[in-house]
């Protein structure tokens, strides 16, 4: 069995201010067991935009139906874009552990570039 | 508060068919996957067939696969399970359960008794 | 399929342990549900592997590791006597399994 791989195929995207996101993700395996989190930054500093397990993340909506069984796409779109949303986003696959999982493997992740809205 | 409510069960003649249903309530009921598990009297629990959130994905385990029928309407809360050719092998409570992020169970109805018999 | 004990028993304030084996840890996740009398509704008391729900008091918790998972009821309780099933999700399978239940006496 392949181990599993995170894809993101953009290695950019730009969206106007106003407008929403879409950041593609996808798995090529749903073994080993765990959740798929989203952040912007890499490092101890990096935030938390989307957490498959729990949390509300008003702004942020998944592409596919993530309560599929064999979903493996973990897509999401962000909302009412401002250029504070500008950074690079990492979709990052965590597998199970106790008490805290464990970060298996990350995207190579998207830069989301904010244009300014039309006028 | 979360609710789930079975209903429909009753006593049926082996061959015939029932539609077992779950009205739901307290949380968002479209946003969840659900599923239906029984147990048989003196025996412990079998799960039976799972359903995505919007409803396009279903999944049955292979005893039930062809003969049971899970669904659901987002609109009335609702999750249903259309049984066919019952047995007296089906004899049992059906439990309808909120799936987690993971599809395991975190809330369960009452149960609703289904007795097949002649 | 999932192995687990038929019975367990103990005296109020100890800490009972039951297992459940059969699973593989890369592509399961477990739960334990709480059946108080045949027939009655279960009561999620761990999923997840560790995660309580909210309502469920601090003295249940879990762990999973290697092929096995285990329910720990510190200071145990006399309403804590009930059949305990472990469940597990395989996510090479899609399919839920159960353990044939243990049930807890507590003396």
């Known amino acids: 069995e392949d181990e599993l791989q995170v894809i993101q195929p953009e290695k950019s995207v730009s969206v106007a201010a106003g407008e929403s996101a879409t950041l593609r993700c996808a798995m090529t395996s749903l073994i080993p067991v765990g959740p798929i989190m989203w952040f912007r930054g890499a490092g101890a500093g990096r935030e938390l935009i989307y957490n498959q397990k729990e949390g509300h993340f008003p702004r942020v909506t998944t592409v596919s139906e993530l309560t599929k069984r064999n979903n493996l796409d973990f897509s999401i779109s962000i909302s009412n874009i401002t250029p504070a949303d500008a950074g690079t986003y990492y979709c990052v696959k965590f597998r199970k552990g106790s008490p805290d999982d464990v970060e298996f493997k990350s995207g190579a992740g998207t830069e989301l570039s904010v244009r300014a809205k039309p006028s | 508060d979360v609710q789930l409510v079975e209903s429909g069960g009753g006593v049926v003649r082996p061959g015939e068919s029932l539609r077992l249903s779950c009205a739901a309530s307290?949380?968002?009921?479209?946003?969840?996957?659900m599923s239906w598990v029984r147990q048989a009297p003196g025996k412990g629990l079998e799960w039976l067939a799972g359903?995505?959130?919007?409803?396009?994905?279903?999944y049955y385990i292979d005893s039930v696969k062809g003969r049971f029928t899970i669904s659901r309407d987002n609109s009335k809360s609702s999750l249903y399970l259309r049984m066919n050719s019952l047995t007296a092998e089906d004899t049992a409570v059906y439990y309808c359960?909120?799936?987690?992020?993971?599809?395991?169970?975190?809330?369960w109805g009452l149960g609703t008794l289904v007795t097949v018999s002649s | 399929a999932l192995t687990q004990p038929a019975s367990v028993s103990a005296n109020p304030g100890e800490t009972v342990k039951i297992t459940c084996s059969g699973g593989d840890y890369y592509s399961t996740y477990y739960a334990w549900y709480q059946q108080k009398s045949p027939g009655s509704a279960p009561v999620t008391v761990i999923h997840s592997d560790d995660e309580r729900p909210s309502d469920i008091p601090s003295r249940f918790s879990g762990s999973a590791s290697g092929s096995a998972a285990t329910l720990i009821i510190t200071g145990v309780r006399v309403e804590d006597e009930a059949v305990y099933f472990c469940?597990?999700?395989?996510?090479?399978?899609?399919?839920?399994?159960f353990g044939a239940g243990t049930t807890l006496t507590v003396l």
């Open positions: 307290g949380f968002t009921f479209s946003s969840h996957a």
């Open positions: 359903i995505s959130a919007g409803g396009s994905d279903t």
């Open positions: 469940g597990g999700y395989d996510g090479r399978t899609y399919i839920n399994t």
């Open positions: 359960a909120r799936e987690t992020w993971n599809h395991l169970f975190d809330y």
